[in-house]
Amino acid sequence: MAVTACQGLGFVVSLIGIAGIIAATCMDQWSTQDLYNNPVTAVFNYQGLWRSCVRESSGFTECRGYFTLLGLPAMLQAVRALMIVGIVLGAIGLLVSIFALKCIRIGSMEDSAKANMTLTSGIMFIVSGLCAIAGVSVFANMLVTNFWMSTANMYTGMGGMVQTVQTRYTFGAALFVGWVAGGLTLIGGVMMCIACRGLAPEETNYKAVSYHASGHSVAYKPGGFKASTGFGSNTKNKKIYDGGARTEDEVQSYPSKHDYV
């Protein structure tokens, strides 16, 4: 029973985690304009992996996609790749883990096969979670580096032909969503790996014992017993959780820097 619960919980936690990774990847608020030293601008800038947005205090939001592939920073490309790999691995892991669930009977699938599938999905979830955490962390590191560079620019003065107010970016909501989601996927994967140990059939062959009866020499060999901690077909209602990722940018919403939010 404990194995089924661990496996089921691992699946649900991973599912929530992967939904979060998808949501984070799609979100536009990976980096948001730092308002600490510049709270008086009536324009709020924020950026995602796929587009950058500007929200005016009048409520109008304009988002522009990054329509170039070669012109983008290598780090951004790397973050995109990590997040996509995380999503793909997570999705495959979910698919595998559905068939591996103890509460689902598919033909005459043996426990050993289910154990292997559970382990496979668990590893996939762990790698998926690590990819997401790595992607978000790389982006966060990039932000920190740029933040201090732009802070230095603020005080040393900016040369060049185009005069612009130095916009510094700080951590956006997507980073926190990504970290939490990656962590959940990782935890889910670990839980699946733990469940796999309980599902794996252990061959316990008892040594043959010879009984010498008077007059006859009879060797009695009891058959090898398969020790399994698994319980029979535990038919429970299977809930499919739909983790929908939504972005909030086309809605006329107002940035947090104003006192009229």
Epitope: Q33, T41, A42, N45, V54, E56, S57, T164, V165, V261
Partner: antibody, heavy 117, light 113 residues
Framework: VQLQQSGAELVRPGTSVKVSCKAS????????IEWVKQRPGQGLEWIGM????????HYNEKFKVKATLTADKSSSTAYMQLSSLTSDDSAVYFC???????????WGQGTLVTVSA | DILLTQSPLSLTVTAGEKVTMSCKSS????????????LTWYQQKPGQPPKLLTY???TRESGVPVRFTGSGSGTDFTLTISSVQAEDLAVYYC?????????FGGGTKLEIK
Amino acid sequence: VQLQQSGAELVRPGTSVKVSCKASRYAFTNYLIEWVKQRPGQGLEWIGMINPGSGGTHYNEKFKVKATLTADKSSSTAYMQLSSLTSDDSAVYFCARGGFGNSFAYWGQGTLVTVSA
Amino acid sequence: DILLTQSPLSLTVTAGEKVTMSCKSSQSLLNGGNLKNYLTWYQQKPGQPPKLLTYWASTRESGVPVRFTGSGSGTDFTLTISSVQAEDLAVYYCQNGYFYPYTFGGGTKLEIK
């Protein structure tokens, strides 16, 4: 888009006045209402803005004590109350609807407030 | 507060002439996020409320005649009227839409000979 403002007001110093701005032919809660002051023969001064959807406001520090902005969604009307009036408050007050680029896209006809003893 | 300085204070021109007026900001109004300049131009005719001409420094509002053109970036902006008409008699104001509080220039009064 139409913004219809209340009529001219002649008020005593030290009293207060409430100017109204009725919006029509657009979704009132979707756009900010901005308020602007223009003294006779002079330039324009931004007073503040209100988000009619949430009731949230943002003021020019200079007018934070002087003006209070409110909005009534049911009647699609924005209000500006001016308190402790002095002769310096004698001006034409405009309401305007926010637009792209934080511009003021549509304007009311203006309300003349005269503060006189 | 951002200071917007308009020049000249007044202009007297003949109908059909080309007119240029300037607006200088004490700080850059260019937003790095979308590379747009948050400067707006208005026309105010006597006894009327101001009318929006251009926003984002150069985007003409719908219904505004093509003879009105806004240009410039950063701190220096210009409004050009390619061929002045008699109905263009008005005061022209520029407005900062980037920093709070929003501020207006002192205005340029256009008079027709």
